[in-house]
């Protein structure tokens, strides 16, 4: 092209991919009539004719730019729409009169690359690896021109270093003719690398200017070997029987190594393996004192096969013994004196209390009880307990039961029953004493005895109601080696007079069964007068 | 073009060891991973083992200890040794490209079956 | 480990269908995953990569969405070369596959 040499640098035009590109014809007047204008695109040095302007209309040349090419401003601008990364070239605008000159115009086109797509090595790396290994990779799609890729680690610039840190790159064109940027980090990692936070930036260029964007950071599994190894036990404090102890093996090595858990026995001095759960935890539960012991666990690489072993740890099962009492089973006769002494083991310091097992009253705070001037009524269940301050919910009982010599006591002296004729009546009579007594009855039945407690018996009687039953009533006797006594049972017929509206309440403890002498499943309930109950 | 083929024993007995050998071409040991794919008859794929370009080598934990992975880069092999057999280890055992820019298999070899019976 | 599960395991469909198949993560995978079809007597083939990317040369009536535990394998029109077994794969810590969905013809 004559003069080729002298023409000025093109005029730069930026747009984004998919946006309008306007160049506009910068020939001046005095170099040509912009109502006479051929535009070019010139590709590979090659020019093809786009467009022609003749007295300010124009016309779209046949090719791959005949449907985006439009003029505006009076004939001046050539509006090229949807513009492709593939119009990225020099087009040029050729005045013809009064003599040829020419105005050239770079288009340059941009497009901003999708968020990098970041995605970590899924298997982890090794400290020890030979050369640097692939730690993450980073795809930026669809950018033009091609965007450049940053790592960071930590948020620092990473710089290829030999042998340490090796970034390797490389892109696609998509049919768009946008590009695909792909980059892998590889790197040499130490075990601190652990915690690195790497991600990777984009940098690239649209016409307002250097943007940039930053994939999510990422932390790679980092494989070291173990130096250390440690016991944990769980709960941690004071221990105690009953709990749920778990100890684990614990290492500084990623991945865990393979661990076993050893006790010493205090014999033999010799550690023994003790069986882990699945996890490598062994349980202890119900924790018992013979669990107290020195622990260590053992670790071992199985690809090395070298072992670690642990600082041994010292495990205390607290415990209190079976709580014994003297004496153990006490026998006093009326107005007497007796002391209560409890003992037992611990491995921390006792502290007992004596408690009234009836009533839960504290009697004394100590290991012994002495109780003086003792009545009937002293007679029935001493607790003692001794427990540990410092480790709540740590105690052990033991019950003793006093029993007071004296000739039967009864539950109540005479007692009003009501009745109906032909029926059968269940009838009940309570005695205490010590010894324990035996009850009789005045009146034939069927009588069965139930000890309630070593100084305690419950007798009862089914007896079929008869006129003569009706007219002497029925006695129980208890008696044992030191006397006896009697209640006297009162029966009393029903009749419609007799019966009150709450005349359907248990007396509780003797009740009266139908016959087959009255109707088929019926039931009468007797009913019991109130009065006071009277002992001795 | 990118190939990997399988060779091995088809048929091994209890107790015994397989070695499978994976041959690639196409493409360098030392620029793109591989890894070992099994599928037992009518079952999903499991992961087995795998060996990155640098030669780091990977397990599944399930087989650790049963599993070596190694290569030899001037014959474009990989070899893989599964000990102690059980029938249960029936499968098409396949090798598998990794991707040089991600973390998927990209290109498979047409598989081997192996099975284990006495 | 992280578990791969996919729904249905069975599908039947007619050529022409729009087809979505399920896959769920156990924990959040972010977008590792990869989509396969295998076909009987076959290997496995890539078909979707990073969750959503197309691998080269899959028609582009495969198409994958999701990220986090959730993804979607869709075929916006079935095609008779399409019946085949698809299974999706993590690789977000290890390699884990789902248990297959058979798509068959209805």
């Known amino acids: 092209v004559p003069g080729e040499a002298e023409q000025p640098a093109p005029e730069l035009v930026e747009v984004e991919v998919g946006s309008t590109a306007l160049l506009k014809c910068g020939l001046s007047q005095s170099q040509g009539n912009l109502s006479h204008v051929d535009w070019f695109s010139v590709h590979k040095e090659k020019r093809t004719l786009i467009f022609r302007v003749r007295q300010g209309q124009g016309q779209s040349e046949p090719g791959e730019y005949e449907q985006r090419l439009s003029l505006q401003d009076r004939g001046a601008t050539l509006a090229l729409t949807q513009v492709t990364p593939q119009d990225e070239r020099i087009f040029l605008c050729q005045g013809k009169r009064p003599r040829s000159q020419e105005y050239r115009i770079q288009l340059r086109v941009y497009k901003a690359p999708e968020e990098p797509n970041i995605q970590v090595n899924p298997l982890g790396i090794p400290v020890n690896s030979k050369e640097p290994e692939e730690v993450a990779t980073c795809v930026g799609r669809n950018g033009y021109p091609i965007p450049q890729v940053i790592w960071y680690k930590n948020g620092r610039p990473l710089k290829e270093e030999k042998n340490r840190v090796h970034i390797q790159s490389s892109q696609t064109v998509e049919s768009s003719g946008l590009y695909t940027l792909q980059s892998i980090l590889k790197a040499q990692l130490v075990k601190e690398d652990k915690d690195a936070q790497f991600y990777c930036e984009l940098n690239y260029r649209l016409p307002s200017g250097n943007h940039m964007k930053e994939s999510r950071e990422v932390t790679v599994p980092v494989f070291y070997p173990t130096e250390k190894v440690w016991l944990e036990v769980e709960p941690v404090g004071m221990l105690k029987e009953g709990d749920r102890v778990e100890i684990r093996c614990l290492a500084d090595g990623n991945p865990p190594p393979h661990f076993s858990i050893s006790k010493q026995n205090p014999s033999t001095r010799e550690a023994e393996e003790e069986t882990t759960n699945d996890n490598g935890v062994l349980v202890l539960e119900p924790a018992r004192k013979e669990h107290s012991g020195r622990y260590e666990c053992q670790a071992w690489n199985l690809d090395t096969m070298i072992s670690l072993l642990s600082e041994p740890q010292e495990l205390l099962v607290n415990y209190v013994s079976d709580v014994r009492v003297s004496p153990a089973a006490p026998e006093r006769q009326e107005g007497s004196s007796l002391t209560l002494t409890c003992e037992a083991e611990s491995s921390q310091d006792l502290e007992f209390q004596w408690l009234r097992e009836e009533t839960d009253q504290v009697l004394e705070r100590g290991p012994v009880l002495q109780l003086h001037d003792l009545k009937r009524e002293a007679g029935g269940g001493y607790r003692c307990v001794a427990s540990v301050p410092s480790i709540p919910g740590l105690n052990r009982t033991q019950l003793v039961k006093l029993a007071i010599f004296g000739p039967p006591w009864m539950a109540f002296k005479e007692r009003k029953v009501w009745v109906k004729e032909n029926m059968v009546l269940n009838l009940s009579c309570e005695a205490s004493g010590h010894p324990r007594p035996t009850i009789s009855w005045n009146v034939n039945g069927t009588a069965s005895e139930q000890d309630q407690d070593p100084q305690r018996v419950l007798s009862t009687l089914n007896v079929l109601v008869t006129p003569e039953l009706l007219e002497t009533g029925v006695e129980c006797t208890a008696s044992n080696d030191l006397g006896k006594n009697t209640s006297i049972l009162f029966l009393e017929l029903v009749n419609l007079t007799t019966l009150t509206p709450d005349s359907n309440t248990t007396t509780g403890l003797s009740t009266s069964t139908a016959s087959p002498h009255t109707r088929a499943n019926s039931t009468s309930t007797e009913r019991k007068l109130p009065e006071p109950e009277s002992r001795g | 073009q990118v190939t990997l083929k399988e060779s091995g024993p088809v048929l091994v007995k209890p107790t015994e060891t397989l070695t499978l050998t994976c041959t690639v071409s196409?493409?360098?040991?030392?620029?793109?991973?591989v890894s070992w794919v099994r599928q037992p008859p009518g079952k999903a794929l499991e992961w087995i083992a795998a060996?990155?370009?640098?030669?780091?080598?990977y397990y599944n934990s399930a087989f650790k200890s049963r599993l070596t992975i190694s290569r030899d880069t001037s014959k474009s092999q990989v070899v893989l040794t599964m000990t102690n057999m059980d029938p249960v280890d029936t499968a098409t055992y396949y090798c598998?490209?990794?991707?040089?820019?991600?973390?998927?298999?990209?290109?498979w070899g047409q598989g081997t079956l192996v099975t284990v019976s006495s | 480990d992280i578990q791969m599960t996919q729904s249905p395991s069975s599908l039947s469909a007619s050529v022409g269908d729009r087809v979505t198949i399920n896959c769920k993560a156990s924990q959040n995978i972010y977008n590792s995953l990869a989509w396969y079809q295998q076909k009987p007597g076959k290997a496995p083939k890539v078909l979707i990569f990073?969750?959503?990317s197309l691998q080269t040369g899959i028609p582009s009536r495969f198409s994958g969405s999701g990220s986090g535990t959730d993804f979607t394998l869709t075929i916006s029109s079935l095609q008779p070369e399409d019946f085949a077994t698809y299974y999706c794969q993590q690789f977000y810590s290890g390699y884990t596959f789902g248990q297959g969905t058979k798509l068959e013809i209805k």
């Open positions: 598998a490209r990794r991707y040089g820019y991600g973390w998927y298999f990209d290109f």
């Open positions: 060996i990155s370009s640098g030669g780091t080598t």
């Open positions: 196409g493409f360098s040991l030392t620029s793109s991973g």
């Open positions: 990073n969750a959503n």
